[in-house]
């Protein structure tokens, strides 16, 4: 059964950064190097996280708090507390099982991580393409001709030399 921590449990007096050392009449001993306790009353200290391989140390382990890791250049964190490091790709690419691949025509990725996403379909909002999309950038939608009052100056996009939205690969 779980006892309420009280006078009957002398270990409850051991603060964070220590453990209750039963081998030494339940006195509070400091956590040994490479370990920590973030709460009081612990019978053992926790093993510090080690930032190795593609992980690098962002914050050293202390007696009361765990180490924090981030990723070496060319990688980015994934998951809670940077539990994984994933390879960066260039803008205009996405990471697949076979490595970094260029975004397919009609999709883009403006970051070094994540997946390629489809260009915005301007016509769904009744708008026209103002700036063509590329692998790295989404299209920019402009007002539809009907939105322009007579005599208003219209921004005329440069005549596409290729099919709309396409850019040199």
């Amino acid at each position: 059964f779980e006892r309420t921590r009280s006078l009957q449990d002398p270990c409850s007096n051991c603060p964070a950064g220590t453990f209750c050392d039963n081998n030494r009449n339940q006195i509070c001993s400091p956590c040994p190097p490479n370990s920590f306790s973030s709460a009081g009353g612990q019978r053992t200290c926790d093993i510090c996280r080690q930032c190795k391989g593609v992980f690098r140390t962002r914050k050293e382990c202390s007696s009361t708090s765990n180490a924090e890791c981030d990723c070496t250049p060319g990688f980015h964190c994934l998951g809670a507390g940077c539990s994984m490091c994933e390879q960066d790709c260039k803008q205009g690419q996405e990471l697949t099982k076979k490595g970094c691949k260029d975004c397919c025509f009609g999709t883009f990725n403006d970051q070094k991580r994540g997946i390629c996403r489809p260009w915005t379909n301007c016509s769904l909002d009744g708008k026209s393409v103002l700036v063509n999309g590329t692998k790295e950038r989404d299209v920019v939608c402009g007002p539809s001709p009907a939105d322009l009052s007579p005599g208003a100056s219209s921004v005329t996009p440069p005549a596409p030399a290729r099919e709309p939205g396409h850019s040199p690969q």
Epitope: D9, C11, N22, C31, P32, S35
Partner: antibody, heavy 120, light 111 residues
Framework: EVQLVQSGAEVKKPGSSVKVSCKAS????????LNWVRQAPGQGLEWMGY????????KYNEKFEGRVTITADKSTSTAYMELSSLRSEDTAVYYC?????????????WGQGTLVTVSS | DIVMTQSPDSLAVSLGERATINCRAS??????????MHWYQQKPGQPPKLLIY???NLESGVPDRFSGSGSGTDFTLTISSLQAEDVAVYYC?????????FGQGTKLEIK
Amino acid sequence: EVQLVQSGAEVKKPGSSVKVSCKASGYTFTSYGLNWVRQAPGQGLEWMGYINPGSGYTKYNEKFEGRVTITADKSTSTAYMELSSLRSEDTAVYYCARWGLGRNWNFAVWGQGTLVTVSS
Amino acid sequence: DIVMTQSPDSLAVSLGERATINCRASESVDSYGNTFMHWYQQKPGQPPKLLIYRASNLESGVPDRFSGSGSGTDFTLTISSLQAEDVAVYYCQQSNEDPLTFGQGTKLEIK
């Protein structure tokens, strides 16, 4: 008496997940880390990771990172180990084991073990 | 990872005789004045049982015919006078470095 009582045997299909429980009694559940160690048939012992039920802190063997999740329910003094994407090589007896005293990081109290069989 | 290698893989000893099991770590398991090496006994159909902690300390309730010695990378578990109930598999374990690792086990039988 300090005791760890585990859930019963499981038979699972490849690709599925299994969740094994470990109910602790006879000590202050939140004061000691609870580990999971597995043993394939006729093989040695392999540490999978542990949880500090007081803080919720977990530490996993990198070999299992991403496939194993260890949790604890303080209200019932029960720890759980979930292993996903099971394959035939995961057929083993899974033990929960409590840390010993102090700074030793050894396994002083063991559950009776749970046999997990992965077979199509 | 620290690799633990036990020798021999199996051992047959007469009742009342001394049994010696060795364990070698691929790197030192000494740290800050402590030796993070432990020994376990496992009988068929049962979970392991802690015998020796930190190389040479006898766990409570374990008969004093069991003893442990060593430091750094080389360790020994000794049973001074083998009893029938000592037939089991014995494992060493290091806790100096994450991940915690075990030896492959040594099977002890009666000759």
